[in-house]
Amino acid sequence: KESCDVQLYIKRQSEHSILAGDPFELECPVKYCANRPHVTWCKLNGTTCVKLEDRQTSWKEEKNISFFILHFEPVLPNDNGSYRCSANFQSNLIESHSTTLYVTDVKSASERPSKDEMASRPWLLY
């Protein structure tokens, strides 16, 4: 039987390796049954998650799932860090797992490291 609770489909310990200067969309896949919940993004600062107020967000609707998108236009070096989306549903706060953005400031395309290299070269990270 399919649950009618709101569910947020961000994988635990998920990561995205992205480049400063590029556009990027961070998606929070949201499953709900009737009324679409109010969803917000926050950025982790230690143990607290600071709500992102003045950031461009949008919804993308698909047949079985909706996506609440945080837009980075463009990605900046200080966008590096961990993010979480949260949904308000029937007075309950449902929090996603956090997802981490690793931002590299690469001067030219020829210098772009692979995902594996970025994971193993923390000095590239801001």
């Epitope: 947020l8 994988k11 998920s14 956090s98």
Partner: antibody, heavy 119, light 112 residues
Framework: EVQLVESGGGLVQPGRSLRLSCTTS????????IHWFRQAPGKGLEWVGR????????KYTASFKGRATISADGSKSIAYLQMNSLKTEDTAVYYC????????????WGQGTLVTVSS | DVVMTQSPLSLPVTLGQPASISCRSS???????????LNWLQQRPGQSPRRLIY???KRDSGVPDRFSGSGSGTDFTLKISRVEAEDVGVYYC?????????FGQGTKLEIK
């Protein structure tokens, strides 16, 4: 029915490379992390690393970094483990496993494939 | 790396009797999301491992309720209330809180 089937094992000479495949069915591979583990004869389990088929991100145990490459083709529901510069001590049964990434709802293991590194 | 230490390494048990396996981690397995990612696997002779317990105490579907997991932080236990012949095999704890993920050495359960 959920299935994970490893293939590509066998006898390989030291210094050579090998690519193992893990063919999955019965679930959406992109909702999971694909892990590779190995078990040397008569020994315990060791985590090699994992891949996120949704975006290609990979993590490895330090001793495998640079020598192992884990990848996945989400459209074909197949994951791969490429092992280079094989040594005799890499002789083991290699297992793939698929763990649901959002709520830990399932953790499926394949039957394993034996890799024997010997001259 | 997080070191996982199981005891005992060998566990002879009489059929119908209880069994208990301990697993200790070298650092806390409590993640920042408030959950503890400690799993127990069973490997029967000649078979591949299967997940028995996840998130310390949640039983996988199809796992008999004679299996239970408990613990927190760094100290965890797998209990079998009444051992049956089909329970023979090696039991492993493994953590997926911290990279790299690590295993205990395994506990071999056999019938006396």
């Amino acid at each position: 029915e959920v299935q994970l089937v490893e293939s590509g094992g066998g006898l390989v000479q030291p210094g050579r490379s090998l690519r193992l495949s893990c063919t999955t069915s019965g679930f959406n591979i992109k909702d999971t992390y694909i892990h590779w583990f190995r078990q040397a004869p008569g020994k315990g389990l060791e985590w090699v690393g994992r891949n996120d088929p949704a975006n290609g991100n990979t993590k490895y145990t330090a001793s495998f970094k640079g020598r192992a490459t884990i990848s996945a083709d989400g459209s074909k529901s197949i994951a791969y483990l490429q092992m280079n510069s094989l040594k005799t001590e890499d002789t083991a049964v290699y297992y793939c496993a698929s763990y649901e990434g959002y709520y830990e709802r399932f953790g499926y293991w394949g039957q394993g494939t034996l890799v024997t590194v010997s001259s | 790396d997080v070191v996982m230490t199981q005891s005992p390494l060998s566990l002879p048990v009489t059929l119908g009797q209880p069994a208990s396996i301990s697993c200790r981690s070298s650092q806390s397995l409590l993640d920042r999301d408030g959950k503890t990612y400690l799993n127990w696997l069973q490997q029967r002779p000649g078979q591949s491992p299967r997940r028995l317990i996840y998130l310390v105490s949640k039983r996988d579907s199809g796992v008999p309720d004679r299996f239970s997991g408990s613990g927190s932080g760094t100290d965890f236990t797998l209990k079998i209330s009444r051992v049956e012949a089909e329970d023979v095999g090696v039991y492993y704890c493994w953590q997926d809180t911290h990279f790299p993920y690590t295993f205990g050495q395994g506990t071999k359960l056999e019938i006396k």
